[in-house]
């Protein structure tokens, strides 16, 4: 199970993981205490048939070709959490592991 | 965490799970001993912003709007395995749990 890594200088057109730093302050998300910024990454690119397909299911749907199935798209296939300190809706400070905040790998599904 | 379920008569345009029976015999996949057919389901539909987004990450990437990010697409967000009996490449009969063969839920990611 692997995925491509790219950067802003890459000429890769296929599904790839790109770097992206999310800045909560710039978004006005002032309920986030820490971190104020983190490396989130994102997925972008084309999904030629079979390239980086995560599941056999994707291949099967392509073969069955049902009405409205749009073919696979470039999407996170492995994500990881980050530890965050934030205010909840009751003015309490909460520390927690927030799942699926970082894209570790991209693929076609 | 929920997702929409549709069928061939639905008028729903948003991201939805549709029924799909995969027939291995029809595909010519003769190395599959059993099951010969199974209910795989598939995802199809539009991902309006925020609708059925599985991860906060999806929302953050939309806000950051980096070069080449295409917006979320309708993709499996929960999958389950099936038990299969099949021939491997060494002519051995294998019984095993094959992951991610059935779409249980669709969402935008």
């Amino acid at each position: 199970d692997f995925g491509l890594d790219c950067d802003e200088h890459s000429t890769e057109s296929r599904c790839c993981r790109y770097p992206l730093t999310v800045d909560f302050e710039a978004f006005g998300w002032d309920w986030i205490i820490a971190p104020k910024r983190y490396k989130a990454n994102y997925c972008s690119g084309e999904c030629e048939f079979v390239f980086l397909q995560k599941y056999p299911h994707t291949h099967l749907v392509h073969q069955a070709n049902p009405r409205g199935s749009a073919g696979p798209c470039c999407t996170p296939t492995k994500m990881s959490p980050i530890n965050m300190l934030y205010f909840n809706g009751k003015e309490q400070i909460i520390y927690g592991k927030i799942p699926a905040m970082v894209v570790d790998r991209c693929g076609c599904s | 965490d929920f997702g929409l379920d549709c069928d061939e008569h639905s008028t729903e345009s948003r991201c939805c799970r549709y029924p799909l029976t995969v027939d291995f015999e029809a595909f010519g996949w003769d190395w599959i001993i059993a099951p010969k057919r199974y209910k795989a389901n598939y995802c199809s539909g539009e991902c309006e912003f925020v609708f059925l987004q599985k991860y906060p990450h999806t929302h953050l990437v939309h806000q950051a709007n980096p070069r080449g990010s295409a917006g979320p697409c309708c993709t499996p967000t929960k999958m389950s395995p099936i038990n299969m009996l099949y021939f491997n490449g060494k002519e051995q009969i294998i019984y095993g749990k094959i992951p991610a063969m059935v779409v249980d839920r669709c969402g935008c990611s």
Partner: antibody
Framework: EVQLLESGGGLVQPGGSLRLSCAAS????????MSWVRQAPGKGLEWVSA????????YYSDTVKGRFTISRDNSKNTLYLQMNSLRAEDTAVYYC??????WGQGTLVTVSS | EIVLTQSPGTLSLSPGERATLSCRAS???????LHWYQQKPGQAPRLLIY???NLAAGIPDRFSGSGSGTDFTLTISRLEPEDFAVYYC?????????FGGGTKVEIK
């Protein structure tokens, strides 16, 4: 950008009063509890008082209880600290803060005859 | 009431050396709400490490935090000139905030 700007500090005689203000910008002020923290010259940080988002609940350290009053005006995005019966040991830089992350630059209060 | 005791009061070290700062609580505290600040002369404190061991944004990875229960540690693996400052631990419980007395890291 979040900014907390304190004002109202100065020289006051023992037994006197002073009112500090903290103007908040870049922050959804009405959603958060706010605090005052002080630092005597050459000393460490001391939490003084806190108030919840609506202003309905207030909290004080034992050293200032009964003498200081914290309040807020959410329509003006402003936090206040009314300080009465001031003592020499109240001399400090007073910081307005949304603990633990946002702090003002502080205003100096000197209590001396 | 929880009391946080920091030691040593002053740490005299040279650039490049390792600094180990201690923060001891009078009773067991939640590691989720034990934070460290750095303060330089004439400046407001800034959040350095949150929830015992997580680096705040923009903080270099030569800083690290650890601990649980009553004993917490801030470590600077290799001191840089800009690291000479005062460091405070802080605990949060409800609307009550407690600060340690601080450790001054000075140039030897």
């Amino acid at each position: 950008e979040v900014q907390l700007l304190e004002s109202g500090g100065g020289l006051v005689q023992p037994g006197g009063s002073l009112r500090l203000s903290c103007a908040a910008s870049g922050l959804t002020f009405s959603r958060y509890g706010m605090s005052w923290v002080r630092q005597a010259p050459g000393k460490g940080l001391e939490w003084v008082s806190a108030i919840n988002s609506s202003g309905g609940s207030t909290y004080y350290s034992d050293t200032v209880k009964g003498r200081f009053t914290i309040s807020r005006d959410n329509s003006k995005n402003t936090l206040y600290l009314q300080m009465n019966s001031l003592r020499a040991e109240d001399t400090a830089v007073y910081y307005c803060a949304r603990l633990p992350d946002y702090w003002g630059q502080g205003t100096l209060v000197t209590v001396s005859s | 009431e929880i009391v946080l005791t920091q030691s040593p009061g002053t740490l005299s070290l040279s650039p490049g050396e390792r600094a180990t700062l201690s923060c001891r609580a009078s009773q067991s505290v939640s590691s989720s709400y034990l934070h460290w600040y750095q303060q330089k002369p004439g400046q407001a404190p800034r959040l350095l490490i949150y929830s015992t061991s997580n680096l705040a944004a923009g903080i270099p990875d030569r800083f690290s935090g650890s601990g649980s229960g009553t004993d917490f540690t801030l470590t600077i693996s290799r001191l840089e000139p800009e690291d000479f400052a005062v460091y405070y631990c802080q605990h949060y419980s409800g609307y009550h905030f407690t600060f340690g007395g601080g450790t001054k890291v000075e140039i030897k």
